[in-house]
């Protein structure tokens, strides 16, 4: 039975040209995290493998930095970066946990970080 929950940075906003940290945290499970994938739509942004470290997809290498921790830093933001981002935690033996973050990139300087909140976990098995 999957008992874990993912806490994320939730709905966040940032200024065009700036940077933002996407962060998820898996709690309430003793499952081993083998890999975390960061995704946007059908694009894989990055993989953090527990043994092998980070792989940033070549499409994003110039604008994405690994960390802090299992998080991801997006740099040189454009309005096209607005949208949903997902952290996919691959764990053993539980399976897969998914967290969702919505990022809005704003033209003006009114961007504020949303509050942290918990979302229900979603899962699928391979």
């Amino acid at each position: 039975m999957m008992t874990g929950t993912i806490e994320t940075t939730g709905n966040i906003s940032a200024e065009k040209g700036g940077s933002i940290i996407l962060q998820c945290h898996l709690s309430s499970t003793t499952a081993q995290v083998t890999q975390v994938n960061w995704e946007q739509q059908d694009q894989l942004l990055a993989i953090c493998n527990a043994d092998l470290g980070w792989h940033i997809s070549p499409s994003f290498k110039d604008r994405v930095a690994p960390g802090p921790g299992l998080g991801l830093t997006l740099q040189s933001l454009t309005v096209n970066d607005t949208g949903e981002y997902f952290c996919i935690y691959h764990t053993y033996p539980d399976g897969t946990y998914t967290g969702r973050i919505f990022l809005e990139v704003l033209e003006s300087s009114v961007a504020e970080h949303g509050a942290r909140f918990q979302i229900p976990h979603h899962h699928h098995h391979h």
């Epitope: 994938n37 092998l52 980070w54 997809s57």
Partner: antibody, heavy 120, light 107 residues
Framework: EVQLQESGPGLVKPSETLSLTCAVS????????WNWIRQPPGKKLEYIGY???????YYNPSLKSRVTISRDTSKNQFSLKLSSVTAADTAVYYC??????????????WGQGTTVTVSS | DIVMTQSPDSLAVSLGERATINCKAS??????VAWYQQKPGQSPKLMIY???YRYTGVPDRFSGSGSGTDFTLTISSLQAEDVAVYYC?????????FGGGTKVEIK
């Protein structure tokens, strides 16, 4: 230039342990990931597992109970042991390097492969 | 495990013509797909990674495309030295898995 060379017996008896070694030249095995992949005759390539730069191992769950991958950093080589073999383990066995940072799980250097037959 | 299914099993194409190989993943693997070329008696060689990026030294007649579950390797103008078996692989999650291969021959 990274070079990998597999060695080991080409014939193993059923129920025995298959042992292969991969000698690496031109690169240190304390960097990147070092892998074993096999190809049974007429079948798909099958990922066996890796030993990472730090010595951590991953094994394909389908083989996990029978597989051990180890390394000898002083000789710059790594090894595969597969116990309790059957005819289904007959395959060409490849050792390979994977540069995860640049290419993810795509394998960029392969040995030439060694054929292992399981038969009495 | 994620199953990678290639089609067709074999393909005969005239020299200079286009060859198209398909690979379907049993679940969404985003862009975590590689393609390999294996010539007779040789080990596989990496051609494409991250679905569409050519590996160092790979001729530009080879291209990869797709995301999600459907991927394609295209050889825009087949040369004699391209005769080989081509394999796709997913590395979205372990265990990393391969397709069954597509044999490309000259018609």
């Amino acid at each position: 230039e990274v070079q990998l060379q597999e060695s080991g017996p080409g014939l193993v008896k059923p129920s025995e342990t298959l042992s292969l070694t991969c000698a690496v030249s031109g690169y240190s095995i304390t960097s990147d990931s070092w892998n074993w992949i096999r190809q049974p005759p007429g079948k798909k390539l099958e990922y066996i597992g890796y030993i990472s730069y730090s010595g951590n191992t991953y094994y394909n769950p389908s083989l996990k109970s029978r597989v051990t991958i180890s390394r000898d950093t002083s000789k710059n080589q790594f090894s595969l042991k597969l116990s309790s073999v059957t005819a289904a383990d007959t395959a060409v066995y490849y050792c390979a390097r994977l540069d995860f940072s640049n290419y993810g799980g795509a394998v960029d250097y392969w040995g030439q492969g060694t054929t292992v037959t399981v038969s009495s | 495990d994620i199953v990678m299914t290639q089609s067709p099993d074999s393909l005969a194409v005239s020299l200079g013509e286009r060859a198209t190989i398909n690979c379907k993943a049993s679940q969404n693997v985003r862009t975590a797909v590689a393609w390999y070329q294996q010539k007779p008696g040789q080990s596989p060689k990496l051609m494409i990674y991250s679905a569409s990026y050519r590996y160092t030294g790979v001729p530009d007649r080879f291209s990869g495309s797709g995301s999600g579950t459907d991927f394609t390797l295209t050889i825009s103008s087949l040369q004699a030295e391209d005769v080989a078996v081509y394999y796709c692989q997913q590395y979205y999650t372990t265990p990393w898995t391969f397709g069954g291969g597509t044999k490309v021959e000259i018609k």
